[in-house]
């Protein structure tokens, strides 16, 4: 049966035994800045091109055991959520991966900047269709990272990022705080904000919308046919990157402002239990859970 | 995220160091009264001191970025400091990434074309 997260983002009239769109997002390229990935996983094989870009810090600790499957875990799962054959949102989207996070899931602002610059240069050298950049990472507020995101957005690129898993104001983190970036918080199957131990999804006025981000089934790097469930605002952001890819594939001329408006317009409204957020943040936090558009563009979205 | 609202620095730390151009007799000294700023991550554990992104003013060309980076290295060397230019940015933001002692920040902030300098910091998978 259809995983809860795909059911949640699918308009009611398309909810059958399986998630419908076989070719959603085919005109769009999604760049993923994350860990290394297992590109021969059955979910994403032939859909993800691993670029030669790599800029990561050394792993912490003296006893670290580097295992390919662990190094690839985060990125492989997210690539699967965006465009996986069985459990992906935009099954037609092609992806390109850049490695900016090490085997422990840690990167640097400078490495991320160089990655964003790489994408811009690639765009200039070989202009293609609409581009979506998925940034499933967060650090402290960074003026320079936000500025780079702003420049890339002004070049027509759609940037989607994780709000952060710190149960805190997203405005204190980057790239979540960059106004031009679409910042995504995480909700669960009960439309509750996701709790991750003592921490949980970030919130506040720098969040644009929420999306499924708890117990998300996706590609596991343990083997080429394995699946695993993961949680976090990265998974939520991957859903929105997939939805954005489908919207842009249907309407390639959409501006960032129009795409943002559509994402908000088609979201489920006022379903999140706001009591989870600190009192002073409730009015500032958008009560929106991302969803695909209904039948308005039936022929475009569900080919 | 959340467009249409003014940028929020939150706890973001900003050290504003006034530019003084009497040192080194800079040929391309910035206009009087302008200040370049230094920024670092508000969360100390995520700071990566020793690596800095030097961001130059918006219209700075690649050749000027390279020249500014070389000038920093030369001035640092005169003071007995080793520096390493790790990357020169162009395409998105003009500037360069430099590995150097924090002692050189005041010097770097006085270089021509410098808009601000940010200490590198960690980002994490979410």
């Amino acid at each position: 049966s259809i995983p809860w997260n795909l059911e949640r983002i699918t308009p009611p009239r398309y909810r059958a035994d399986e998630y419908q769109p076989p070719d959603g997002g085919s005109l769009v390229e999604v760049y993923l800045l994350d860990t290394s990935i297992q590109s021969d996983h059955r979910e994403i094989e032939g859909r993800v091109m691993v670029t030669d870009f790599e800029n990561v810090p050394e792993e912490d600790g003296t006893r670290f055991h580097r295992q390919a499957s662990k190094c690839d875990s985060h990125g492989t799962h997210l690539a699967g959520v965006v465009s996986g054959r069985d459990a992906g949102v935009a099954k037609g989207a092609s992806m390109r991966s850049l490695r900016v996070l090490n085997c422990q899931g840690k990167g640097t602002v400078s490495g991320t900047l160089i990655g964003l610059e790489f994408i811009r240069k690639s765009q200039l050298v070989q202009p293609v269709g609409p581009l979506v950049v998925l940034l499933p990472l967060a650090g402290g507020y960074s003026r320079v990272l936000n500025a780079a995101c702003q420049r890339l957005a002004r070049a027509g690129v759609v940037l989607v990022t994780a709000a952060g898993n710190f149960r805190d104001d997203a405005c204190l983190y980057s790239p979540a705080s960059a106004p031009e970036v679409i910042t995504v918080g995480a909700t669960n199957a009960q439309d509750q904000p996701v709790t991750l131990g003592t921490l949980g999804t970030n919130f506040g006025r720098c969040v644009d919308l929420f999306a499924p981000g708890e117990d998300i089934i996706g590609a596991s790097s343990d083997c080429s046919t394995c699946f695993v469930s993961q949680s976090g605002t990265s998974q939520a952001a991957a859903h929105v990157a997939g939805i954005a890819a489908m919207m842009l594939s249907a309407e390639p001329e959409l501006t960032l402002a129009e795409l943002r408006q559509r994402l908000i317009h088609f979201s489920a409204k006022d379903v999140i239990n706001e009591a989870w957020f600190p009192e002073d943040q409730r009015v500032l936090t958008p009560n929106l859970v991302a969803a695909l558009p209904p039948s308005t563009h039936e022929n475009l979205y569900f080919q | 995220g959340a467009m249409g609202q003014e940028d929020e620095d939150g706890d973001y730390e900003e050290l504003v160091l006034a530019l003084r151009s009497e040192e080194d007799g800079l040929a391309e000294a910035p206009e009087h009264g302008t200040t370049a700023t230094f920024h670092r991550c508000a969360k100390d554990p995520w700071r990566l001191p020793g690596t800095y992104v030097v961001v130059l003013k918006e219209e700075t060309h690649l050749s000027q970025s390279e020249r500014t980076a070389r000038r920093l290295q030369a001035q640092a060397a005169r003071r007995g400091y080793l520096t390493k230019i790790l990357h020169v940015f162009h395409g998105l933001l003009p500037g360069f990434l430099v590995k150097m002692s924090g002692d050189l920040l005041e010097l770097a902030l006085k270089l021509p074309h410098v808009d601000y300098i940010e200490e590198d910091s960690s980002v994490f998978a979410q």
Epitope: E59, D60, G61, T62, R63, F64, H65, R66, Q67, K70, S73, C103, Q104, G105, K106, N165, F166, L196, G197, T198, L199, S231 | K43, D44, P45, R47, F124, A125
Partner: antibody
Framework: QVHLVESGGGVVQPGRSLRLSCAAS????????MHWVRQAPGKGLEWVAL????????YYADSVKGRFTISRDNSKNTLYLQMNSLRAEDTAVYYC???????????????WGQGTTVTVSS | QSVLTQPPSVSAAPGQKVTISCSGS????????VSWYQQLPGTAPKLLIY???KRPSGIPDRFSGSKSGTSATLGITGLQTGDEADYYC???????????FGTGTRVTVL
């Protein structure tokens, strides 16, 4: 309900070995780093060891390095502490504790078990 | 020998405020997140504060944390008899690659 339950404590002679277990329930075990912390009678807390969520890295206090080994079985939701060459000064209540977050292991510990007592005595 | 130093004891009357200091160095408190733990008599420790000043849900706002340089402080306002306990600060030490606890402070409500 989030729960950590330690077991395996007891009285052991110096130089012998003991293996402690910590059964976790109520949360996604493989998403969190895990610690062992001990408290000698009438004394303060002493950190013993930490293991990453996926078992890829371990850290130890100098006082136990080379003698104790932390490990985990994510399929069984269980944390272990293998204690070899035990000494009288290892006598303590041993607590397992969950790291606040998987990646930011240095944030501290948010969930603690009730502890299991280890007595090293001849 | 703990690398984080706390006063052995502090006391105050009910309703009053107490502060507990935790002194370290640049390799621990200066550059790492500080947490505070409460250990009531005969029980396991409990997290009170993390990331210098954040409270887990369920911890009343009478408890607060702050950091300045290489020292951290726990504040308890509106002291109650139920607050009688041992309090420990804790943080990662980058030089030792180890988590370190403070020496502990016993809070007595007069």
């Amino acid at each position: 309900q989030v729960h950590l339950v330690e077991s395996g404590g007891g009285v052991v002679q110096p130089g012998r070995s003991l293996r402690l277990s910590c059964a976790a329930s109520g949360f996604t075990f493989n998403s969190f780093g895990m610690h062992w912390v001990r408290q000698a009678p009438g004394k303060g807390l002493e950190w013993v060891a930490l293991i990453w969520s996926d078992g890829s890295d371990e850290y130890y206090a100098d006082s136990v390095k080379g003698r104790f080994t932390i490990s985990r079985d994510n399929s069984k939701n269980t944390l272990y502490l293998q204690m070899n060459s035990l000494r009288a000064e290892d006598t303590a209540v041993y607590y397992c504790a969950r790291a606040i977050a998987a990646l930011y292991y240095y944030y501290g510990m948010d969930v603690w078990g009730q502890g299991t007592t280890v007595t090293v005595s001849s | 020998q703990s690398v984080l130093t706390q006063p052995p004891s502090v006391s105050a009357a009910p309703g009053q405020k107490v502060t507990i200091s935790c002194s370290g160095s640049s390799s621990n408190i200066g550059n790492n997140f500080v947490s505070w733990y409460q250990q009531l008599p005969g029980t396991a420790p409990k997290l009170l504060i993390y990331d210098y000043n954040k409270r887990p849900s369920g911890i009343p706002d009478r408890f607060s944390g702050s950091k300045s340089g290489t020292s951290a402080t726990l504040g308890i306002t509106g002291l109650q008899t139920g607050d009688e306990a041992d309090y420990y600060c804790g943080t990662w030490d980058s030089s030792l690659s180890a988590y370190v606890f403070g020496t502990g402070t016993r809070v007595t409500v007069l």
